[in-house]
Amino acid sequence: APVPPGEDSKDVAAPHRQPLTSSERIDKQIRYILDGISALRKETCNKSNMCESSKEALAENNLNLPKMAEKDGCFQSGFNEETCLVKIITGLLEFEVYLEYLQNRFESSEEQARAVQMSTKVLIQFLQKKAKNLDAITTPDPTTNASLLTKLQAQNQWLQDMTTHLILRSFKEFLQSSLRALRQM
């Protein structure tokens, strides 16, 4: 697994560097997660032909993965910092069950999958510190998550491969959109 943010050799070699600001720390954390996702996608794509599947076929899958929309206030047009931050945190919390599902889906990248999951938890904590309106953040229901996890794990092999691919792709897109939005804050 890659070295977590703040522990790379450059940081060790530069003790006199300015401490990271909150936004730089968040940026670094997201990029670390994105690197992890890239590695996981590489294994998924090497293992199956899901990555070549057409977008239309993928869209038919009924996974309810978090997605950014104009109303969430994260785009340049109609940007709203607080609404957007709530959307990002809520979306990440919703992704957690899917990241749990990924834990037993990788052979050579098992550590990487765990690193993505744990780093996402840390990212949520960073963002919660930044949010003013924590009451607006809805936490997913644990019972609903448990039954969703059971349902996903009961799928046949092809559907499990498809689900893995979709989760990784959607999570990557959500994080990249979050990065774009957070840079405006």
């Epitope: 997201i30 785009f75 959109s177 990065l179 774009r180």
Partner: antibody, heavy 120, light 106 residues
């Protein structure tokens, strides 16, 4: 062959409109960041706008905000730049380019550019 | 928009010289910076991205460094093909460029 081809440039009067097209081949715009950059004669590069494939989210430079609109047609694998209320200072070669799907992104592919001249 | 200030605007140097171009951002941009080379009548081409990562196929005499607001592009030993205009570009918010540095033969 992987390439970008711009079209739609030309001479237009101040206050007029023009729509630039950028046809992509060899890759799909539906899964790539796209960007417009311009360069006035003898001047430097200026970022105009970009479009993130996810949900079609667009960003604009302050100098064009409210006048230019970037859009895409996935079925035609083409991105557009609709330019309204054109001014003399919009005269430039307009390049369509692709942000590499990296974090952070950078431009890994450029078109050859199309010249827009705003003059009466 | 984030302002990118490049210096110098023009740089006269000779083949074999070591040259450095500086780029300063009006706010912190982490390592969200790329360097491009442009020759007259041509589209630019990327040299360095992520502040210090060399693009595939670009000679190793080119190097980039910096983070936050201060960045540099260094050419360790100028070659005849290197006389061109160089631009930095941030991708932290939007994609503004520096005003360019024209590298000319002394």
């Amino acid at each position: 062959e992987v390439q970008l081809v711009e079209s739609g440039g030309g001479l237009v009067q101040p206050g007029g409109s023009l729509r630039l097209s950028c046809a992509a081949s060899g890759f799909t715009i539906s899964s790539n960041y796209m960007i417009w950059v311009r360069q006035a004669p003898g001047k430097g590069l200026e970022w105009v706008s970009d479009l993130y494939y996810y949900a079609g989210d667009t960003y604009y430079a302050d100098s064009v905000k409210g006048r230019f609109t970037m859009s895409r047609d996935i079925s035609k694998n083409t991105v557009y730049l609709q330019m309204n209320s054109l001014r003399a200072e919009d005269t430039a070669v307009y390049y369509c380019a692709r942000w590499a799907d990296d974090h952070p992104p950078y431009i890994d592919m450029w078109g050859r550019g199309t010249l827009v001249t705003v003059s009466s | 928009d984030i302002q990118m200030t490049q210096s110098p605007s023009t740089l006269s140097a000779s083949v074999g010289d070591r040259v450095t171009i500086t780029c300063r951002a009006s706010q912190g941009i982490s390592s969200w910076l790329a360097w491009y080379q442009q020759k007259p009548g041509k589209a630019p081409k990327v040299l360095i991205y992520k502040a210090s990562t060399l693009e595939s196929g670009v000679p190793s005499r080119f190097s980039g460094s910096g983070s936050g607001t201060e960045f540099t592009l260094t050419i360790s030993s100028l070659q005849p093909d290197d006389f061109a205009t160089y631009y930095c570009q941030q991708s932290w918010l939007g994609g503004s460029f520096g005003q360019g540095t024209k590298l000319e033969i002394k």
